[in-house]
Amino acid sequence: GELETSDVVTVVLGQDAKLPCFYRGDPDEQVGQVAWARVDPNEGIRELALLHSKYGLHVNPAYEDRVEQPPPPRDPLDGSVLLRNAVQADEGEYECRVSTFPAGSFQARMRLRVLVPPLPSLNPGPPLEEGQGLTLAASCTAEGSPAPSVTWDTEVKGTQSSRSFTHPRSAAVTSEFHLVPSRSMNGQPLTCVVSHPGLLQDRRITHTLQVAFLAEASVRGLEDQNLWQVGREGATLKCLSEGQPPPKYNWTRLDGPLPSGVRVKGDTLGFPPLTTEHSGVYVCHVSNELSSRDSQVTVEVLDPEDPGKQVDLVSAS
């Protein structure tokens, strides 16, 4: 006869471990008992449980309610047991000793491996600003047993670096993702991917990149000279810029206050029916938490009744 077991039994923390021990012998052989023990290099052999063909299962008080036999129907020569709710301290070597009649005793050892799945955490780096050099975008840490794998999944160009710390029963892995911030990265996902044998599928944590920037400002609205004549309605100046965080807009007139009737609506300056008093230098001031930009334009409103004057529109930034 011989014993059938597994060299290694792998179980996830908190699950039940099946410790297999099958006796393959002649049908007329009887299994008297199966003794299960924990083999510790320091503490020696410690009994877990005894499965007796006549008296049933006896469990060491230290493992009370944690060791059980699977319910019937069971092969009478099956000495497998279940170790409930495996913890890291259960990791180690186990021995199954089968006493048979008339063939005698057989023993086999196996190693129980308890996987501790990681609970990853992602920490964003300092605020990203366009114009910075290589900057930490995010770091991702996962601790488990064995050491988890931590990688990054993103379309963004950058560099990753990992370091690990080994603890007595686990290992922590931290991976950092560095990049040179640019506005094109705004809203792009940066995903930390954690792989581990104790996970059914990879764990993924996504961080959305935010890069602070402010684009140059420019003013639109002077392209059609016919709009800027006395009496015309609907003339507007629009300030063009973009930024993160979204910028605020402010309109002023360089050579005095804004004329009455001129309305400011965010990035747009709306004019009432035009008069020559609307001529002047207008300044758009764009700002966010990162920076500010200005753009100015000179508007001259032509009076068609005054033939000596040509339309003269000058734009300057």
């Epitope: 059938e4 039940d16 099946k18 099958f22 393959r24 002649d26 049908p27 699977p70 319910p71 019937p72 129907p73 092969d75 009478p76 020569l77 099956d78 497998s80 279940l82």
Partner: antibody
Framework: QVQLKQSGPNLVQPSQSLSITCTVS????????AHWVRQSPGKGLEWLGV???????DYNAAFMSRLSITKDNSKSQVFFKMNSLQADDTAIYYC????????????WGQGTSVTVSS | DFQVTQSPASLSASVGETVTITCRTS??????LAWYQQKQGKSPQLLVY???TLADGVPSRFSGSGSGTQYSLKINSLQPEDFGTYYC?????????FGGGTKLEIK
């Protein structure tokens, strides 16, 4: 290689018994036991019972009173007998070898299609 | 009474796709679960035992997973020969019931 060949009737009268023989080759019945399973259109796959390598048996409680599984190791044969058949026992009956894990069915017979009718 | 619920009852997929079939049990069965494939007019064939161990000769595109009361069979990159009906079966307490089956049709 491992084979399980079944032999038995295809037609059984109501209230009569059904006997099927499963002859195995490629392994010993002293090393691996055998299951019996049936498949009917109405009930899908149904586990009926098992004979262990040591000769002891376990039956599905629903069939315990009318089912018997025995074997002859020297002839490499497993015998299935079910009494008091009715129309709803019409099914395909399979024998299957117990696998390396001690429970799953890793090789199956070709099946015996049994109709219970007068 | 002990229940084994298999889902879906049927599914249709294309060659190359990945499919997953699930079995739920009414109590913890501690990985005492097997998966079988059956083709029309043929006997079932063992694919996976002990919830996760691939039977001899079964292609690696098949994989079993799960624990406790929930188990899955995954088939990566479906092949034309994978059509048929799939069953799970538990071996925890009597009777060792089968799931109701999942009929997999190739689109």
């Amino acid at each position: 290689q491992v084979q399980l060949k079944q032999s038995g009737p295809n037609l059984v009268q109501p209230s009569q018994s059904l006997s099927i023989t499963c002859t195995v080759s490629g392994f010993s019945l002293t090393t691996y036991g055998a299951h019996w399973v049936r498949q009917s259109p109405g009930k899908g796959l149904e586990w009926l019972g098992v004979i262990w390598r040591g000769g002891s048996t376990d039956y599905n409680a629903a069939f315990m009173s009318r089912l018997s599984i025995t074997k002859d190791n020297s002839k490499s044969q497993v015998f299935f007998k079910m009494n008091s058949l009715q129309a709803d026992d019409t099914a395909i009956y399979y024998c299957a070898k117990i696998g390396y894990d001690g429970y799953a069915m890793d090789n199956w017979g070709q099946g015996t299609s049994v109709t219970v009718s007068s | 009474d002990f229940q084994v619920t298999q889902s879906p009852a049927s599914l249709s997929a294309s060659v190359g796709e990945t499919v997953t079939i699930t079995c739920r049990t009414s109590e913890n069965i501690h990985n005492y679960l097997a998966w079988y494939q059956q083709k029309q007019g043929k006997s079932p064939q063992l694919l996976v035992y002990n919830a996760k161990t691939l039977a001899d000769g079964v292609p690696s595109r098949f994989s079993g997973s799960g624990s406790g009361t929930q188990y899955s069979l995954k088939i990566n990159s479906l092949q034309p020969e994978d059509f048929g009906t799939y069953y799970c079966q538990h071996f925890w307490s009597s009777p060792w019931t089968f799931g109701g089956g999942t009929k997999l049709e190739i689109k």
